[in-house]
């Protein structure tokens, strides 16, 4: 693909017309070995064919080597996420080599030009890796390329062009525009490394998707569905908007992938788990909290290699900030109703009481609609570790006062004047913890008191471990 410089590496900066003093030959890609956590330390610049800097800067041939690859830039200066990532890698892997791939000259351009430059930058990285492979003890299997946004596709090209197979590529919200639906060799793909894991945090099905929506790795993780990230909403960044632009919201969601990865490096004791699922809606329904057959995995640095999988979509919920870990629960609730509940859906909340802590009042999100006389599955999550669940309280919020709901209530009353109250019967709730995979069944203390109406609450106590019921009879036989 066309690139705005000749073989000698001359660059024309498309955003800033070059001045006479700026047109001399210059390298387009630099490799900065970060020799210290200190961001003010200059580090060492490595170049193909020059072995001295490797010795001077104590490049460890037998250790892991990370290449961090930035994306498109409007500023021409490294953003703070890079400094955080360098520091986190040094903290976690003390002996590792951390190399920052500086391709600012080719990234600080119009987006379309930067995209066209990704291939040549990938080539430069591959050449560096090929040269390092000539050294004794250096193994390509120890190489981990970490690319953010456009940098993820650069990593893909590098993995594609290198002689041999790179150990791992992590794509941190790979860029979407000009890559969505692209041919496998023109974007990051599972073929580019032994293991390719991807975090998608800014995907949109409407409008411009800054991050790529399609799965491009062995495992593709979509935190919070891969779109709206907690802490990045308009309300959360109102401060930014008051003093800046909506750009801050975009940056927050796009960059969240980096911070999730940093979190996985520094908060080892709080690993986040993702669960395989066909789509975001099914995950929101709580259907996909299984760890059987490798259906769950750690996210970020701690992700387990799953080379047999390709484009495996995985989901999780997160907190709004570090540590991002939450605890996922699947609730299976059989709801029985005698009378027609009308078109309105019940607004239900659950509070979980555990041996370590109690949860807040958690909403049972209705993804489509509640099925009556059927088992409904819900996903709830807590920010703290509750420990073993002991009991739970289900509350039905009073009818939302919209004209539509009031009209429905009135209409229901006219059609059933003898039984105006809406009532659900819930005898038991089966709970599965995503993190521990433990299953527990909770029952109402008194089987005759298992009805709930708007404005009421119902308490459930642990009645057995697991889900298999000894008594196979219907839970509703006594209610008829």
């Amino acid at each position: 693909s066309p690139v705005p410089f000749g073989p000698e590496g001359r660059l024309e900066d498309k955003l800033h017309k070059p001045k006479a003093t700026q047109t001399e030959v210059k390298p387009s890609v630099r490799f900065n070995l970060r020799t210290s956590k200190d961001p003010e330390h200059e580090g060492c610049y490595l170049s193909v064919g020059h072995s001295q800097p490797l010795e001077d800067c104590s490049f460890n041939m037998t250790a892991k080597t990370f290449f961090i690859i930035h994306g498109w830039t409007m500023s021409g200066i490294f953003e703070n996420w890079l400094h955080k990532l360098v520091s986190a890698l040094h903290t976690r892997e003390k002996d590792a080599n951390v190399v920052v791939v500086d391709w600012l000259p080719l990234a600080h351009q119009l987006y379309t030009d930067a995209v066209n430059n990704t291939r040549v930058v990938g080539h430069s990285i591959a050449r560096m890796l090929d040269w390092l492979q000539e050294k004794d003890d250096f193994s390509l299997g120890n190489v981990h390329l970490i690319g953010y946004s456009l940098g993820a596709h650069v990593a893909g090209y590098a993995g594609n062009f290198v002689k041999g197979t790179v150990g791992r590529i992590t794509g941190l919200d790979p860029a979407g525009p000009m890559f969505e639906g692209a041919d496998i060799h023109k974007r990051l793909s599972p073929d580019d490394a032994d293991f390719v894991d991807v975090l998608h945090t800014y995907t949109r099905s409407f409008g411009l998707s800054i991050g790529i929506q399609m799965p491009v790795g062995h495992i593709d993780i979509y935190p919070n569905g891969g779109d709206f990230q907690p802490g990045c909403g308009l309300n959360d960044v109102l401060g930014s908007i008051a003093y800046g632009t909506i750009t801050e919201v975009v940056k927050c969601e796009h960059e969240r992938a980096v911070h999730l990865f940093v979190d996985s490096l520094v908060n080892q004791d709080k690993p986040s788990f993702a669960f395989q699922c066909t789509d975001s809606n099914r995950f929101k329904k709580g259907i996909c909290l299984s760890c059987r057959k490798n259906r769950c995995n750690n996210i970020g640095y701690n992700a387990k290699k799953m080379r047999k999988k390709r484009n495996s979509k995985m989901y999780l919920k997160t907190r709004a900030g570090m540590p991002f870990k939450v605890y996922h629960y699947q609730l299976k609730v059989h709801m029985f109703s005698y009378n027609n509940s009308g078109d309105t859906q019940p607004t239900l909340y659950i509070t979980l009481y555990g041996s370590n802590a109690d949860s807040q009042n958690l909403p049972l999100e209705i993804v489509e609609k509640i099925e009556l006389n059927a088992t409904n599955t819900f996903l709830v999550y807590t920010e703290e570790d509750l420990g073993d669940l002991l009991k739970m309280r289900l509350t039905w919020e009073g009818v939302a006062h919209s004209w539509y709901n009031l009209w429905n209530e009135f209409r229901n009353y006219l059609s059933q004047p003898s039984n105006p109250s809406r009532e659900l019967y819930i005898r038991r709730i089966r709970v599965k913890s995503g993190e521990t995979q433990r299953k527990v069944t909770f029952c109402t203390q008194d089987p005759t008191k298992s009805s709930i109406s708007p404005g009421q609450e119902l308490w459930f106590h642990k009645c057995q471990d697991g889900w298999k019921m000894k008594n196979k009879t219907s839970p509703f036989v006594n209610l008829a």
Epitope: H16, G76, F78, P105, G239
Partner: antibody, heavy 120, light 107 residues
Framework: EVQLQQSGPELLKPGASVKISCKAS????????IHWVKQSHGKSLEWIGH????????NNNEKFKDKATLTVDKSSSTAYMELRSLTSEDSAIYYC?????????????WGQGTTLTVSS | DIQMTQTTSSLSASLGDRVTISCRAS??????LNWYQQKPDGTVKLLIS???KLHSGVPSRFSGSGSGTDYSLTISNLEREDFATYFC?????????FGSGTNLEIK
């Protein structure tokens, strides 16, 4: 020892242009960015913009994008800032400062400042 | 743009005193806060970076602290050369912005 040596004071008429220089020494010029800061009389500091000497890429504060043009001459390790269509509002002390490779990096070394007076 | 506010524009103190200069950001700046000293002759020097990291050659009587939106610079045992103007600056988001300055004068 890191040093940033700026050009001397300037007295100019409204409508004129001026080019202020900042010569760096004591470090590898292309390993850091050069930033320009304005201090109006008795006022605070305002960031004008920066240039990355490695490839000449610039980024200006929106407020100064039509006022200041930043360039470098790598052979002499010198950064330049040209201010055009001068008015009395441009009368100030202008500083060049060195900064590391990240947003968060501080301005760790400063030039002595160049006083610009615009008067008819 | 992120607004940096130094509410105290002027501060009087005596030699040997301990003084604290505060700085508030209009939004969370993730500890990317730097402090500078400007002498009457216009010379500007970096004192502290990343909220609390002392720049090389800066005396240990200078210290910095804070998080989120609120930050402060403390000089523990004032010496004659410390009487100057102090500026805070955020490095979280472009454009980089400075506080209005606090002038520390001798009592």
């Amino acid at each position: 020892e890191v040093q940033l040596q700026q050009s001397g004071p300037e007295l100019l008429k409204p409508g004129a242009s001026v080019k202020i220089s900042c010569k760096a020494s004591g470090y590898t010029f292309t390993d850091n960015t050069i930033h320009w800061v304005k201090q109006s009389h008795g006022k605070s500091l305002e960031w004008i913009g920066h240039i990355n000497p490695y490839y000449g890429g610039t980024n200006n504060n929106e407020k100064f994008k039509d006022k200041a043009t930043l360039t470098v001459d790598k052979s002499s390790s010198t950064a330049y800032m040209e201010l055009r269509s001068l008015t009395s509002e441009d009368s100030a002390i202008y500083y060049c400062a060195r900064k590391g490779i990240y947003y968060s990096s501080p301005f760790d070394y400063w030039g002595q400042g160049t006083t610009l007076t615009v008067s008819s | 743009d992120i607004q940096m506010t130094q509410t105290t524009s002027s501060l009087s103190a005596s030699l040997g005193d301990r003084v604290t200069i505060s700085c508030r950001a209009s939004q969370d700046i993730n500890n990317y806060l730097n402090w500078y000293q400007q002498k009457p002759d216009g010379t500007v020097k970096l004192l502290i970076s990343y909220t609390s990291k002392l720049h090389s050659g800066v005396p240990s009587r200078f210290s910095g602290s804070g998080s989120g939106t609120d930050y402060s610079l403390t000089i523990s045992n004032l010496e004659r050369e410390d009487f100057a103007t102090y500026f805070c600056q955020q490095g979280n988001t472009l454009p980089f912005t400075f506080g209005s300055g606090t002038n520390l004068e001798i009592k």
